[in-house]
């Protein structure tokens, strides 16, 4: 029959060439002479000339060695024609299958692979996967079937079989317990890929396995006991730097220390913070310490990490004995600010109050007093007793020195310590009002017309406080009442001044006496300019000059 079974030809054949493969034969050759030919890629189209056919015998010829990795199968057509060129058979399919030889080594996809795994993981934990390829046939033969293995491990600690590689997938896994970053932070594996499923050609690559840090080491105080001296009253004072060692990866959360005061700080006097670079615990005073109350504190500080421990680890504790050093403390006025009521205008030498300070120090120190700031110079202070007396006229109405009835004085207490220290106190004198000011009109100069004059409204002011102010009374004296009239308007504390009789244009003195509710009288002379005009005027008009 005009049929050819698929032909298998091994690649890399040694010849001699041309090499006879198979014979094409048409049974029509009994009747006529047959000529054979082949067409298709590998015959008359690229790659041309790989195959040929003996025209008269029908022998299929191979002209050169084949390469399966280049072309694994050729599909040709066989033709049979009679002497006159007429086809005697339909074109026949010829399949030539190139069979594989193990002519390629495996090739890793990378020369160096990198991966990582946490320290302390259990055997069986996957680390990374490596891949090698082989161009040979891995389906019909083992030529391209790659088997992976670990050739060597560097270093060999704690032993030389810390990892395994899956023979067919290339997955590297941990096979032994004992991965400890603090002992071996990295392994270098020389890995092999061997074809023929492990029995053929071998190639190597490197797999670098970094061991990642886990918080499997607790920070430990070194030293564990500290002794410090701190002056009393110092706030924010560095008491001690506590040092820890931690074998975990520096500057990682597993290494960074967290400090906690766990005992001995009942008064919340101390605080501890982690130094960002050195990892030391910086113990400082949150509040001032008091030597007189407690001259020694024993603190207990615990250290952990920012990251939680991955296993149960003992917590390190440090003991810090803090000796409080006595400091000559300043005397303290009791109270720091003292309010005293005193009547203004009391005589010089009159006692105001006794204002004294206490010294916190244990030894009885002598305290002397003096006035530090007395803006008006109104007071004196006894250096021994702290007795404050009047040395000038206390004037509640003196706005240069008195604000809201209060005169403020600063006093000083100095002890006889070495060196001496000073404390200040504030004495606030609330000045009680005395009716020492009469009412005063405003303004004191007026301009008024002598015909149909407008009344002049003057405001009444009194520097004293109620009840030494309104209601006010007005009275004109020294014959001013002949031409003028004064009336108090109680509603708005004003006095209305009116011209009763005609006065020629000139300037006149109006003697106005005002008295307050406490009958404190004040005489004020009002300068009145009378103008030749009608009704309202601001300024006298210029005299009329005839033409």
């Amino acid at each position: 029959d005009w049929v050819v079974a698929p032909i298998s030809v091994p690649e890399n054949g040694k010849g001699p060439f041309p090499q006879r493969l198979n014979q094409l034969k048409s049974n029509k050759d009994r009747d006529t002479k047959i000529f054979y030919s082949i067409t298709g890629p590998g015959a008359d189209s690229p790659p041309e000339g790989v195959f040929a056919v003996e025209k008269e015998t029908g022998w299929l010829l191979l002209n050169k060695p084949l390469d399966r990795e280049e072309i694994a199968k050729y599909e040709l057509f066989g033709h049979a024609v009679s002497e006159n060129g007429a086809s005697v058979e339909d074109p026949m399919n010829i399949s030539i299958i190139v069979t594989d030889q193990n002519d390629h080594k495996p090739k890793f996809t990378q020369d160096t692979f990198r991966g990582s795994v946490l320290e302390g993981v259990l055997p069986g934990t996957s680390v990374m996967q490596v891949t090698a390829t082989d161009e040979d046939d891995a389906i019909h033969t083992y030529n391209g079937v790659v088997a992976y293995s670990i050739h060597s491990q560097e270093p060999k600690d704690p032993h030389d079989l810390m990892f395994t590689i899956h023979r067919s997938t290339g997955t590297i896994s941990v096979i032994s317990s004992g991965l400890d970053r603090e002992k071996v932070p990295e392994y270098t594996l020389t890995i092999q890929a061997t074809d023929m499923d492990g029995d053929g050609s071998t190639t190597t690559a490197v797999a670098v396995v970094e061991i990642l840090d886990a918080n499997d080491n607790a920070p430990v105080f070194d030293p564990q006991k500290y002794e410090s001296h701190v002056p009393e009253n110092a706030v924010g004072h560095e008491v001690q730097r506590l040092t820890v060692t931690d074998l975990d990866a520096p500057n990682s959360p597993a290494w960074r220390a967290t400090y906690l005061i766990v005992g001995g700080d009942d008064g919340d006097h101390f605080t501890i913070a982690t130094h960002p670079e050195s990892n030391q615990g910086i113990l400082t005073t949150r509040k001032g310490l008091d030597f007189e109350a407690k001259n020694q504190h024993t603190l207990y500080v615990e250290v952990t990490n920012e990251a939680p421990f991955v296993l149960k680890l003992p917590t390190s504790t440090a003991t810090i004995v803090v000796h409080v050093e006595d400091v000559n403390e300043a005397p303290v006025f009791v109270p720091p600010s003292k309010v005293v009521e005193v009547q203004e205008g009391i005589p010089t030498g009159e006692a105001v109050c006794v204002y004294t300070a206490k010294d916190p120090d244990k030894e009885n120190q002598k305290i002397s007093y003096r006035i530090l700031r007395d803006p008006a110079g109104w007071l004196a202070m006894d250096p021994d007793s702290g007795q404050v007396t009047v040395a000038g006229t206390l004037d509640r109405e003196d706005e240069r020195f008195v604000r809201n009835n209060i005169y403020e004085v600063m006093v000083l207490a100095v002890d006889n310590g070495s060196p001496p220290t000073t404390g200040t106190g504030t004495l606030l004198l609330t000045l009680i009002d005395v009716n020492d000011h009469g009412p005063v009109p405003e303004p004191r100069e007026i301009t008024i017309c002598n015909q149909s004059p407008e009344s002049q409204v003057l405001n009444i002011t009194d520097k004293d406080l109620s009840p030494h102010t309104s209601p006010f009374q007005a009275q004109l004296t020294d014959d001013s009442d002949i031409y003028w009239m004064a009336e108090v308007n109680e509603k708005d504390d004003t006095v209305v001044l009116s011209l009763k009789k005609f006065l020629k244009q000139d300037t006149y003195d109006v003697h106005l006496s005002l008295s307050d509710h406490g009958n404190k009288e004040q005489l004020t002379v009002i300068r009145a300019t009378v103008c030749d005009c009608h009704g309202h005027v601001e300024k006298c008009p210029d005299p009329w000059k005839g033409g």
């Epitope: 020369d111 560097e154 270093p155 990295e186 270098t188 490197v206 970094e210």
Partner: antibody
């Protein structure tokens, strides 16, 4: 002071063998990977081989199977056994210390080099 | 193997001027896990062994003057000498240590104009 001193170079016929030595001092020899690098006359640098602290090795394909790197930590000495020498192996051979012990601390960078020893392969 | 290509092969620079040498790798030298580029720069003066200048692409080796700086990431790297001095005349090499075998660039010769 870190010092590396190569010796053992010289003239050898093609196909012959030679063993180079590198004496190290001034650092903890056993703690560092050490490399061999060569430089053909008037040419650039070519890395040949490394030996890690535990004795593991790696080679450039041009010398794999012909050259063998080894170390004797007790003598602070590195060796390069060169077999089947070819004319193209003619070069100055340097030993060079890795700056780090591990890949992650940069062991591929070489911070100290010897002065080199000249190997000439010629008939 | 990773191929390292330097440019230019040689350059002449006036004293005090800036010199720039480029280095290109056939594959990335950046390891994503630690964000480090596995590249070093060396200086080799005539008759002397090479001297390490830069590692991790940009970290200056101790004792190296600060006029030398390295930059770049992935496949493209640069060595810069900010103000060339007479003593900088040398051949400069880049080297990858991302993958075995370690490979060097062909070198760049720096001369003074």
């Amino acid at each position: 002071e870190v010092q590396l001193l190569e010796s053992g170079g010289g003239l050898v016929q093609p196909g012959g063998s030679l063993r180079l030595s590198c004496a190290a001092s001034g650092f903890s020899f056993s703690s560092y990977p050490i490399n061999w690098v060569r430089q053909a006359p008037g040419k650039g640098l070519e890395w040949l081989s490394v030996i890690w602290t535990g004795g593991g090795t790696n080679y450039a394909s041009s010398v794999k199977g012909r050259f063998t790197i080894s170390r004797d930590n007790s003598k602070n000495t590195l060796y390069l056994q060169m077999n089947s020498l070819r004319a193209e192996d003619t070069a100055v051979y340097y030993c060079a210390k890795s700056r780090g012990v591990y890949d992650f601390d940069g062991r591929g960078a070489m911070d100290y080099w010897g002065q080199g020893t000249l190997v000439t392969v010629s008939s | 193997d990773i191929v390292m290509t330097q440019s230019p092969d040689s350059l002449a620079v006036s004293l005090g001027e800036r010199a720039t040498i480029n280095c290109k790798s056939s594959q990335s030298l950046l390891y994503s896990s630690n964000q480090k580029n596995y590249l070093a720069w060396y200086q080799q003066k005539p008759g002397q062994p090479p001297k390490l200048l830069i590692y991790w692409a940009s970290t200056r080796e101790s004792g190296v003057p600060d006029r030398f700086s390295g930059s770049g990431s992935g496949t493209d790297f640069t060595l810069t000498i900010s103000s060339v001095q007479a003593e900088d005349v040398a051949v400069y090499y880049c080297q990858q240590y991302y993958s075995y075998p370690y490979t060097f660039g062909q070198g760049t010769k720096l001369e003074i104009k």
